[in-house]
Every structure is written in C-alpha cells, then in structure tokens.
Interface confidence: low
C-alpha cells in the first residue's frame, strides 16, 4: 500500500471547494433540546447567500428546522438530528463553518436557550424540592472529546422555588475555578462549560434546596484527549474483483477521520504506453473527489456496464491535515465464457459481480461534477 507518495494526475479534475482553515466544532445536545448553530461571516464582512447542509444534503426549512443566513435552529432534537452540519456559501460551496452534532440522552452538552425547564408555580402550597425531569438525569457519566461544550442539568421544582448551587469534587464550584469560566443558568437549572479540557474531569454535583429540604445529583465528566491522526481506511471486501463484461461493479472503503478528509477515487492509467511519469511517479486519473464532513464515511465507487479497459488498479485515497492513507483495489474484466470458468471458485470468494445491468441517470449522480472528460469515462458513473 503506497502512502503519501505524490502521483501525477491525468485528466480534467474539477477543483473541490475546501473548508476554511479551523477546527470542526464538536457539540453534544440532549434529546429534546433545541440545537442552535451560529456561523458569523468571516472577518465580519458581508456573508452573501448561504446554505445549511447536514451530512452532505441541503436542509429544508420547516416548523422544526429554522434556517437563517448565519444561524440554524433545530427544535426538539432527536438522535436522527445527529450528524455533520455545515454552513456554505451558496455559489462556491465553500464551507464557512462546520459542526459535528451528537444528540444523546440527558445530561446534554451544548447550550440551548429553550427555557423548557424554567421554574414554574406548581400550585403546591409548600413542599421540598423534587426533580421535574428525572428521566433526563439517568446518564450519570458523560465522556466527551476535549473542546466540546458540556451542560449538566438538574431540572427541579418546589415551593418556595428552590435555589441551585454546584460543587466540583465535593467543593463549591465557581467560574474563576476554570479557564473560560462557567455559565450558570438558574432558570434552566444548568451548568455550562465551554471548550472542556482534561483538567475539567471530575464529579459535578448540583445541590437544590429550599427551607423544606435538599436534593442532590452527581454527574461524572470524563474529557477524552484526541490524538491527531491521518485518515484510517478499512477496505470493503472483496478488495480484488473479477467481473463479467457489461456487468456493474462496486468498490467501497470506509474512511475514519476526525479532521475533514479529502477523499478521492483514482485509477492507475497508462500514458503513451507508460504507467509512470519521467520522475517515476504513477499516472493516475481522478474519478471522484470531494471533502467529507463526517467522522466516518462509507465511500463507494460504482462502475456500470464495465468493459475490458475498466480493468486495472483503483485507489481509495483520503487526506487530512495530518497525512494520507490509501487502499488499492484490482478489477479484472472477462468475457462471459472466461468468467463462467472462474465462477465457482470466484463465487465462493464473493468476488463476482455479474448482476443485472443498471442504467444510472444523472439524477442518481446527485448532480456531482464529472471530474474527468466524458470521453475517458463515457460509461462510468459514481455514487
């Protein structure tokens, strides 16, 4: 497997819009929270038309999804709302901001302003404090990557309205005890810490009390340090495939990367009968190229109606700011008779893809730009 070696690119590769330099913001929200993402214009300048995208698909505004040029709100979030969100310039598709959003059971991280747990008059004459949302306090251990925003909540009620205070490792916890401070939202019964670091690990206790009694809840926070690493590729099996002329073939490989990886499908080609350039670097042509916004991407290359010239070596390559990882895939294309002779042996290995021919429309392509000339790839379509 060749890693990080330069390769000569042949064919007309369209330029892929790259993300702005900067970290992907990691946010964790509780189920039922309002997810609120804000993307101010870079340098305070004019923003221009923008589009909000989740996992590569444009978001359609609705009663629950409120879309503005610099702000996105998703109300009453559920697990399905987890994913990679980005705000892009509509014309260039340049990524202005990107967020990784995870929606979990309470306690949540993130800092919504939904106010749903504000103190209310319960109509009870007098009474000791009690938890109003105990089902959202089940998760006692919260493990989040460094740089996340964390919020602990202890929604409660009582008459008179109880007060809430916070302890860290059994001692009074105040803003000056951590760099970056803390936000205490008494009406939401919450403690918010932005951009957590390993020194924030510990036990956090909310103490809710009025003159009739006191209740407390302890949460444990673990902050996970991230180790920088280049993308990790897990090849889909089989890596080498034998296909019948005219059939469809699909390669896929899984890409894992904390930082946004630039993913490419490449094919080794010959130029003037040579596989390598004068300096010894292989000639490759770019079949597909894009920037992934998910931590884990299952990337596929689909070749429809293969011919003999589709045979050869294909590469799945992922690059992030740390490094490059590649996986090689081989495709052999045979006429029907040659393939039948190999069928029994190959079928056991699961490597014959001789399914029905499928016509793939431009619509199926998701409007992606073709990255090399139509002539070179007149029957190649990629998903």
């Amino acid at each position: 497997e060749s890693l990080g070696t330069e390769q000569r690119v042949v064919g007309r590769a369209a330029e892929v819009p790259g993300p702005e330099p900067g970290q992907q913001e990691q946010l964790v929200f509780g189920s039922g929270d309002a997810v609120e993402l804000s993307c101010p214009p870079p340098g305070g300048g004019p923003m221009g038309p923008t589009v909000w995208v989740k996992d590569g698909t444009g978001l359609v505004p609705s009663e629950r999804v409120l879309v503005g040029p610099q702000r996105l709100q998703v109300l009453n979030a559920s697990h399905e709302d987890s994913g990679a969100y980005s705000c892009r310039q509509r014309l260039t598709q340049r990524v202005l901001c990107h967020f990784s959003v995870r929606v979990t059971d309470a306690p949540s991280s993130g800092d919504d302003e939904d106010g749903e747990d504000e103190a209310e008059d319960t109509g009870v004459d007098t009474g000791a404090p009690y938890w109003t949302r105990p089902e959202r306090m089940d998760k006692k251990l919260l493990a989040v990557p460094a740089a996340n925003t964390v919020r602990f909540r202890c929604p409660a009620a009582g008459n008179p309205t109880p007060s809430i205070s916070w302890l860290k490792n059994g001692r009074e916890f105040r803003g000056e005890h951590r760099i970056g401070g803390i936000k205490l939202r008494h009406q939401q019964w919450s403690l918010v810490m932005e951009s957590v670091v390993p020194s924030d690990r510990g036990n956090y206790t909310c103490v809710v009390e009025n003159k009739f009694g006191s209740i407390r809840q302890t949460y444990t926070l673990d902050v996970l340090e991230r180790s920088p690493h280049r993308p990790i590729l897990q090849a889909g099996l089989p890596a080498n495939q034998t296909a019948v002329l005219g059939s469809d073939v699909e390669f896929h490989c899984k890409v894992y990367s904390d930082a946004q990886p630039h993913i490419q499908w490449l094919k080794h080609v010959e130029v003037n009968g040579s596989k390598v350039g004068p300096d010894g670097t292989p000639y490759v042509t770019v079949l597909k190229s894009w920037i992934s916004e998910s931590v884990e991407a299952d990337v596929r290359l689909r070749l429809a109606n293969v011919s003999e010239r589709d045979g050869g070596e294909y590469l799945c390559r992922a690059t992030n700011f740390i490094g490059v990882a590649e996986k090689a895939f081989w495709l052999s294309v045979h006429g029907p008779r040659a393939a039948e002779e190999e069928l029994v042996e190959a079928d056991e290995a699961g490597s014959v893809y001789a399914g029905e021919q499928k016509l793939i429309s431009e619509e199926d392509l998701g409007g992606e730009q073709k990255l090399i000339s139509e002539e070179d790839l007149h029957h190649h379509h990629h998903h």
Partner: antibody, heavy 122, light 108 residues
Framework: QVQLVQSGVEVKKPGASVKVSCKAS????????ISWVRQAPGQGLEWMGW????????KYAQKLQGRVTMTTDTSTSTAYMELRSLRSDDTAVYFC???????????????WGQGTLVTVSS | DIQMTQSPSSLSASVGDRVTITCRAS??????LNWYQQKPGKAPKLLIY???SLQSGVPSRFSGSGSGTDFTLTISSLQPEDFATYYC??????????FGQGTRLEIK
Amino acid sequence: QVQLVQSGVEVKKPGASVKVSCKASGYTFKFYGISWVRQAPGQGLEWMGWISVYNGKTKYAQKLQGRVTMTTDTSTSTAYMELRSLRSDDTAVYFCARDGDYESSGYPFDYWGQGTLVTVSS
Amino acid sequence: DIQMTQSPSSLSASVGDRVTITCRASQSISSYLNWYQQKPGKAPKLLIYAASSLQSGVPSRFSGSGSGTDFTLTISSLQPEDFATYYCQQSYSTPPITFGQGTRLEIK
C-alpha cells in the same frame, strides 16, 4: 493516563539477539500502531519500523530489513522489538512510541516509552 | 527517501530570547511536519504536529509555521526548561519516517 513502559537495560555480545518490550496502558491498544525509534550515543533519532496492533502489519526501515522483527501481544497490551545479529553500531537507546493509527505509519508520535539502553560489546 | 535538514545544528541563547529553528525537506511534504523536544536522558516529546498545531499541554510560547519544503519552530520567549535538543520529522512519505539531525539549544 497514557503510558508506555519499556524493559530494562540489555548488554549483548556481537552476533546475539535482543528483544525489547513496551507495555502500553491508558488507551485502547489495538486502535494504534507502535513505532520503534533508536538513538545511538550522542546521535539523532532513527526510525526503525512500525507495527499495526490492529492487524499485525509491519513496515521496517530498509537498512534493518531481515534483522528486525516487531510483534505485539494484545492480551497484555505489549509490543516487542527483536533485533538479531547484533553489531557494535547497534548500541543505542531504543524507544517505542505510540503511532496514532492502525493502518499506516507516519503520524506524530504523541507518547513515548522511557527508552531501553542496549549495549553491544565483546 | 525524504531528507530533512535542520539549521542551525546548535544555538546559544538567553532566557527571554526569541528563538527560531528551521527545517528543510528535500521535496514537498505539504504540512506533514512534526517537531519534538528532547532533554538529555529522556524520551522526545511532541510539541507541534501538522506544521503548526500545538500538541495539548505544550506552552503557547512554542509555535510552528511553514508548508511545502520550509518550516520553522519559534520559541517566543525562552524559559530555562526550554534548553534541549529539537528535532523535526516528516510524516508525509512513509516508510521511512525521517527526522532532522537535531538542533541543540544551549544557554548563552
């Protein structure tokens, strides 16, 4: 916290073999690689090779090919580096380092063992 | 193999000084460059990865810059504990991973 603890000092005769161990703790051993780096007295750092804990794949520096073998034992979270046919110029401090990937080497080495001095002398 | 050349090979400076160490690669390595600090009898310690990203726990007086073939490690205000040997390392084309020959930073 992440720690890599190496075995102790070794004194060997030319032609012998040495096997250095590196016990990892504080992280998921199989999701990382281990690289081995050596440093001769008063000299710079020389990369020897890498092993994927996940799948056992190895990559060795060309000059050591055939003399070095890297292995791991996931049950004890330990990596091993064996160097055979020792020569006097193999005298060095040998370091293991966590390599942040289990598919390919080349990441920054974010955690290192304390080093094992191997002296080759007749 | 990609060769990494550091300069200077040794350097004398005083506490409070601003110090710059450079590293040149024999071919373009994009931003795949790491910097390490090593003190006598100790293992190297990662300071900067990906040319300019500060490893967690490393003081902000350390910074890195550059891309392609030319890279710089800067210590904005030398502290007594910064006197050590510094190595650059490329992680672009592997194997092999290659290190610079080191820059020894001494007290003037």
